[in-house]
């Protein structure tokens, strides 16, 4: 059949070139005796101007002349023309005829329509509707330029080069013309939001189109974020945990919470826990989920900070028995823990472990226990438990004393350690008088209290017969035990008033009570210090102005016609006082410690009073020791050279300096003080800190040479100084020099020498040293 | 040589529109993407969008969607853009600058329009 | 939005001093598509640095740039006075494109 195929329409870009595919066909019966004519026309319609010509090309209209070119090869049926230099008036329809002989001519009516603009028309990306991760897709750009002559090129930009893979394909048929660029790329999350460019150059024209990429992905990125971090927390506290999401396309559709792999309700973001408690710790996980997947987080330990103690065994604990306690921590405790263990508030020592073993437990193990954890951020105590190691009463403490309250009252005090508590009873001569139970023999004068493990007697209207042998028994479950007294109901009682501890002056009455009823021969020994200090017929001893002489330990008895009554117990009276003027003593040790030693100077300050006395030593204004605070032993004054030492004791501070300066001589002070007065002696130190020295010998002939020099243990050493000379103890010279020199040696130097610095207020005058002159006899 | 030309300065009251400019000069205008951007006094760069003079599609900053509108005019190489509904807050220099495709670097910027809302 | 923070916001540097300021997004930035920019007082940005640490025509050699991912840095070696400026990172690895807050370099 007869007819011409190429496509329906062809773009160019000006100044561009564009091909026209185009094939044709006559039947097979048809002779070819001279070829075939193949000819292109524009506006076929219209002007039908001559684009290409075979046979005739001065047939083609001067516009298309030397810008078109017939591809083809009608041999071959085909018939494509190629437009160069391409001008928007090129626009237009393009029609192909083909003639083999005056009867054998074929017109394509239908023709080509060629569009040609100034600018390139932007190339047309194809994307996937859904872009997933992990699948590969394909974007096409294309465009419907086609230029064989020059490169007509376009390029992919944006793309990930280690995850994508370009190439090009033509497409140049009768049917269509046009261009495709496919970038292959493997789709990644991190994809999403990635800018793809594909670019078209044509001529010197460029075009460019984008797409947004929206990839859809799993979530990344899940993690947990807890606070307060970096610190421990504690029970009751504030607790947060966020499910953190990197990223996530589309948006998180829902969050899961796991604790210890136990699914919680909470669906929100946040995980609050208001008051942190020991349940609350453990492993926790989130998991975040969206359309496309889902991710748990790395799991996240939450440790509550806290102990709790548990006892074993949990019942009764007997002697003997091992008793284990343990410092249990909530689930998750960091590895890092450090324990300890308290018993009644005190650090047991060397007790570090999470166990305390109580290994054959005796009653010292009852008490409360507490452990504490600690790490790098802190440390927390557990609440206490309390430990009770059972047995059976200790041998029970029974004392017994008199109290004056209308007349003498006799007590008797018994009292016992035991677990369980125990049964006591306080007899006399077979009969009870008192139990912690409530039996008593019961008598008006005797009344019974009790607590536990305590019982008190009082017996009034004490007579004779009330003393002798008490008895104090305790019983429980697992024992018994007893305790006796000798009672004497006529012992003595002495009182102080108006107290026991007086200032001196102040006006005290000893008072001498008995058990018995007074009679009016009676008669009253006082001791003082156990000595015998008064005796006569008053109950009372008047001291009217006590003094430091009258303080000490007394003790009365009371005497009638037929019987004594017991001593009393001592009482002791303290008279208080200010300081006595302070005893101050100074002197110099030379070569203490044997040869070379040097020097020590000692000062040494007592003082006599109650309370003790603040003693504090100064030197021109300076305090140079001070007894405070208190406390024995020595040590080297705060701020004072290296060289003194300090010793302290109650009443007495004594100052040692090692090689003395100069500066550290003259009048000290020593100052005592207490609350009630103060006094104050002063000394005078000379530390032989200025040394005279005559060379070479202190003995020299008449006419030698003499060297006195005045050597001066100083601070300011080196720096310049005046120095007094005396000779015979009067005045001899004076200057800038610490060197004198006699030259020559004469009879009438002989003399006693001493030197002293000026510099210094209240420099010591060295010892004097005696110039000997040997001399021959006189003629 | 390239150049991206802009007006010194546009006095606007509140609630007024305005359309900038920026001719382009020195090169093929429709082979380059024009961009805009925002500098407020003694603050950084925001970019406001751009526009594709060949095909006129258009990018915005979601921050400015209802802000601006960008055009162009091929014929005289000039990028527009206009802002509506003046305030205060939209004093600023506003300056165009093409991108290189290759690199997507603005590499010419032009000399920037102060505007200045006031009444 | 990818958002871009430099540090320090000013520095002061003698002539002759080497500084390094920096440039952090909160999302990963294509170093392809990272670019630096000066601006002088009252004066337009000028293209300084692109693709992360390509110098733009003109710019001394003293100047260069690196970094990947979402750290990036510009270091001048050798502080001169015409240095003084406003520089700012830009990313167009996603949209919005973003810039910079800016590091303003003084000269003692």
């Known amino acids: 059949s007869w007819g011409v195929s190429s496509p329906q329409d062809v773009q160019g870009v000006k100044g561009s070139c564009l091909l026209i595919p185009c094939i044709f066909s006559f039947p097979a019966d048809v002779e070819v005796p001279d070829g075939i004519t193949a000819i292109w026309y524009y506006d076929y319609s219209g002007q039908r101007q001559v684009v290409s010509h075979s046979a005739d090309p001065k047939l083609v209209e001067a516009r298309f002349r030397g810008r078109t070119e017939f591809m083809g090869n009608p041999e071959h049926r085909v018939c494509n023309l190629l437009l160069k230099d391409l001008q928007p008036e090129d626009s237009g329809s393009y029609n192909f005829r083909f003639e083999i002989s005056e009867v054998n001519r074929w017109s394509d009516v239908k023709g080509t329509l060629v569009t040609v603009t100034e600018e390139p028309r932007v190339p047309t990306i194809a994307s996937p509707v859904e872009l997933l991760e992990g699948t590969e897709v394909d974007f096409n750009c294309s465009t419907p330029y086609v230029c064989l002559q020059e490169q007509v090129r376009l390029q992919w930009q944006g793309q990930d080069p280690a995850r994508s893979v370009t190439f090009n394909s033509q497409k140049f048929e009768p049917t269509g013309v046009g261009h495709l660029e496919t970038l292959h790329m493997a789709m990644s999350w991190q994809d999403h939001g990635r800018i793809l460019r594909c670019q078209l150059s044509v001529a010197n024209h460029r075009a460019q189109s984008e797409i947004h990429l929206q990839v859809k992905y799993a979530p990344k990125g899940v993690k947990i974020l807890l606070s307060p971090s970096g610190r421990n927390i504690l029970p009751g506290e504030l607790v947060t945990l966020t499910c953190q999401v990197n990223s996530s396309y589309p948006a998180v559709s829902s969050i899961k919470w796991l604790k210890d792999g136990v699914r919680l309700q909470t669906k929100t973001g946040v995980l609050h826990l208001p008051q942190a408690a020991w349940s609350d710790a453990g492993v926790y996980t989130c998991q975040a989920e969206n359309g496309v997947g889902s991710l748990v987080s790395p799991p996240i330990s939450l440790h509550i900070f806290m102990a709790e103690v548990q006892v074993s065994p949990a019942g009764p604990i007997l002697e003997n028995q091992t008793v284990t306690l343990v410092c249990n921590t909530p689930n998750e405790a960091p590895s890092d823990l450090r324990y300890s263990w308290y018993k009644n508030h005190v650090l047991l020592e060397d007790a570090h472990s999470h166990t305390l073993r109580l290994h054959l437990a005796t009653r010292a193990d009852t008490g409360f226990y507490f452990c504490e954890v600690q790490n790098v951020h802190g440390s927390e105590r557990s609440g206490p438990v309390s430990v009770v190691v059972n047995h059976p009463p200790l041998t029970p403490v029974l004392t017994a004393f008199l109290e004056t309250q209308a007349g003498l009252v006799g007590i008797l005090h018994c009292s016992v350690v035991s677990e369980p508590l125990a049964t006591l009873v306080l007899s006399h001569g077979g009969h009870i008088l008192a139990s912690t139970s409530g039996d008593s023999d019961h008598s008006p004068r005797f009344s019974g209290t009790s607590g536990p493990n305590s019982l008190r007697l009082e017996i009034r209207d004490l007579e004779e017969t009330d003393s002798g042998e008490y008895k104090c028994s305790a019983t429980n479950s697992l024992g018994n035990a007893t305790s006796t007294l000798d009672f004497h109901a006529n012992a003595a009682r002495l009182l102080i008033s108006p107290a026991a501890e007086v200032v001196e002056g102040q006006a005290v009455t000893l008072s001498c009570r008995s058990g018995l009823s007074p009679t009016p021969d009676a008669r009253f020994s006082w001791y003082l210090n156990g000595a015998l200090l008064h005796e006569g017929p008053g109950s009372s001893l008047l001291l009217p102005a006590a003094s430091s002489t009258d303080a000490g330990s007394y003790h009365c008895r009371a005497r009638d016609g037929h019987s004594a009554s017991g001593p009393s117990s001592p009482a002791v009276l303290t008279v208080l006082y200010p300081p006595r003027q302070p005893t101050f003593t100074t002197r110099l040790d030379l070569d203490a410690a044997g040869a070379g030693a040097g020097r020590r100077g000692l000062l040494l300050c007592r003082v006599d009073s109650d309370p003790p006395a603040r003693l504090q030593l100064l030197h021109k204004d300076r305090v140079v020791a001070t007894s405070l605070p208190s406390g024995g032993g020595c040590s080297t004054c705060g701020g004072c050279s290296p060289r003194m030492k300090v010793t302290k004791a109650p009443n007495l501070l004594r100052v040692e300096i090692h090689n003395p300066l100069l500066e550290e001589e003259g009048l000290y002070l020593c100052e005592a003080s207490n609350a009630l007065g103060n006094a104050s002696t002063s000394a005078t130190f000379n530390g032989q800190a200025t040394v005279l020295a005559i060379a070479p010998s202190h003995t020299l002939q008449e006419g030698t040479e003499a060297n006195l020099t005045c050597n001066v243990s100083r601070e300011a050493a080196g720096s310049p100084a005046n120095f007094s000379w005396f000779r015979n103890g009067v005045l001899w010279a004076q200057g800038p020099l610490e060197t004198v020199t006699l030259l020559p040696v004469a009879r009438t130097d002989a003399a006693l020498y001493a030197c002293r610095i000026l510099t210094e207020a209240g420099a010591q005058l060295s010892t004097p040293v005696l110039l000997s002159v040997l001399y021959p006899p006189d003629r | 040589q390239v150049q991206l030309q802009q007006p010194g300065a546009e006095l606007v009251k509140p609630g007024a529109s305005v359309k900038l400019s920026c001719m382009a000069s020195g090169y093929i205008f429709t082979n380059y993407w024009m961009h805009w951007v925002k500098q407020r006094p003694g603050r950084g760069l925001e970019w406001i969008g751009r526009?594709?003079?060949?095909?006129?599609?258009?990018k915005y900053n979601d921050n400015f969607k209802n802000k601006a509108t960008l055009t162009v005019d091929k014929s005289s190489k000039t990028s527009y853009m206009q802002l509506n509904s003046l305030t205060s807050a939209d004093s600023a220099v506003y300056f165009c600058?093409?991108?290189?495709?290759?690199?997507?670097?603005?590499?010419?910027w032009g000399t920037g329009t102060t505007v200045t809302v006031s009444s | 939005e990818n958002v871009l923070t430099q540090s320090p916001a000013i520095m002061s540097a003698s002539p002759g001093e080497k500084i390094t300021m920096t440039c952090r997004a909160t999302?990963?930035?294509?170093?392809?598509?990272l670019h630096w920019f000066q601006q002088k007082s009252g004066a337009s940005p000028k293209p300084w640095i692109y693709?992360?640490?390509n110098l733009a025509s003109g710019v001394p050699a003293r100047f260069s740039g690196s970094g990947s991912g979402t750290s990036y840095s510009l270091t001048i070696s050798s502080v001169e006075a015409e240095d003084a400026a406003t520089y700012y990172c830009?990313?167009?690895?996603?949209?919005?494109?973003?810039f910079g807050g800016g590091t303003k370099v003084e000269i003692k």
């Open positions: 693709s992360t640490s």
């Open positions: 830009q990313q167009y690895s996603g949209y919005p494109l973003t």
């Open positions: 600058a093409r991108e290189d495709f290759d690199s997507r670097n603005f590499d010419v």
């Open positions: 999302s990963s930035v294509s170093s392809s598509y």
């Open positions: 526009i594709d003079p060949n095909s006129a599609g258009t």
